[in-house]
């Protein structure tokens, strides 16, 4: 392991579409991969009238945008589907939305998903 780098070996897994996709709904996903690739965790969710609906969580393939991020934070302004990624085991258990170039206080507090 490289000093100062948080290796990701497993992530929280969730799939809202688990019945159609015939996967588990929730669990822990081992992050396998080639030696030259870093692995991360991710979360995607929707904000429907203030209600948070998790879409997917799991391992995410080598992505410079996720390097050295210990927290899973979406910074895009009002996407249709929110996305964040991070490094470190199970770092996607909690995720949050803090849009960049936002003068006012963020409207969303950090989200801790409730178990289904």
């Amino acid at each position: 392991a490289i000093l100062g780098r948080s290796e990701t070996q497993e992530c929280l897994f969730f799939n809202a579409n688990w019945e159609k996709d015939r996967t588990n709904q929730t669990g822990v996903e081992p992050c396998y991969g080639d030696k030259d690739k870093r692995r991360h965790c991710f979360a995607t969710w929707k904000n429907i009238s203030g209600s948070i609906e998790i879409v997917k969580q799991g391992c995410w393939l080598d992505d410079i945008n996720c390097y050295d991020r210990t927290d899973c934070v979406e910074k895009k302004d009002s996407p249709e589907v929110y996305f964040c990624c991070c490094e470190g085991n199970m770092c996607n258990e909690k995720f949050s939305y803090f849009p960049e170039m936002e003068v006012t206080q963020p409207t969303s507090n950090p989200v801790t998903p409730k178990p289904p």
């Epitope: 996967t23 991969g33 391992c59 992505d63």
Partner: antibody
């Protein structure tokens, strides 16, 4: 080096059967989901079937459901596609490909094997 | 099912040109969008995954952008080896992937 090598293609009559194989090397085969994608002559890419890393979950395009069966033997590092009740519209080059973790790209592909269904 | 629409279906360009290919999803696929290059008689090759992440070994003249429903593949300076067909693919509803119809890049 990751390598995928398909075999088993050929000429078959309508209603006939073929079994395609995909031999994998250069990676831990049992850790990855695998998929079959086909390409009819002069056409685009069409997803056909996929199988989870352990072989417990299988998925099919509507166009092949009930006729094709995907399977794998992790001890032999080999992926299979059993194709029954073949039709002329199944004529295509069939590729096996490795699926990586999300965003789940097909990051390595075999060279393809041609299946021709004709009388 | 999510439909993927690529445009244009073909284009003619010269070496050194900047080339842009677009891909639109019928509903949001977040960043679950991959791009492939295919040369005649060869297997597809992964270029970009996650909408913008360059696959190892792919030249930096290739770039991808977008999220949600609208995505772009850009070749900043077209090289002779780039004449090929390019496909987008959504992997949001895996394992039932859907591909775009392809864009053939031809020599002007």
């Amino acid at each position: 080096e990751v390598q995928l090598l398909e075999s088993g293609g050929g000429l078959v009559q309508p209603g006939g059967s073929l079994r395609l194989s995909c031999a994998a090397s250069g990676f831990r085969f049992g850790n990855y989901a695998m998929t079959w994608v086909r390409q009819a002559p002069g056409k685009g890419l069409e997803w056909v079937s996929a199988i989870g890393a352990s072989g417990g979950s299988t998925y099919y395009a509507d166009s092949v459901k009930g006729r094709f069966t995907i399977s794998r033997d992790n001890s032999k590092n080999t992926l299979y596609l059993q194709m029954n009740s073949l039709r002329a519209e199944d004529t295509a080059v069939y590729y096996c490909a490795r699926e990586n973790v999300a965003p789940r790209p097909l990051d390595y592909w075999g060279q393809g094997t041609l299946v021709t269904v004709s009388s | 099912d999510i439909q993927m629409t690529q445009s244009p279906s073909s284009l003619s360009a010269s070496v050194g040109d900047r080339v842009t290919i677009t891909c639109r999803a019928s509903q949001s696929v977040s960043r679950f969008l991959n791009w492939y290059q295919q040369k005649p008689g060869k297997a597809p090759k992964l270029l970009i995954y996650g909408a913008s992440i360059l696959q190892t070994g792919v030249p930096s003249r290739f770039s991808g952008s977008g999220s949600g429903t609208d995505f772009t593949l850009t070749i900043s300076s077209l090289q002779p080896e780039d004449f090929a067909t390019y496909y987008c693919q959504q992997s949001y509803t895996t394992p039932t992937w859907t591909f775009g119809g392809g864009t053939k890049v031809e020599i002007k």
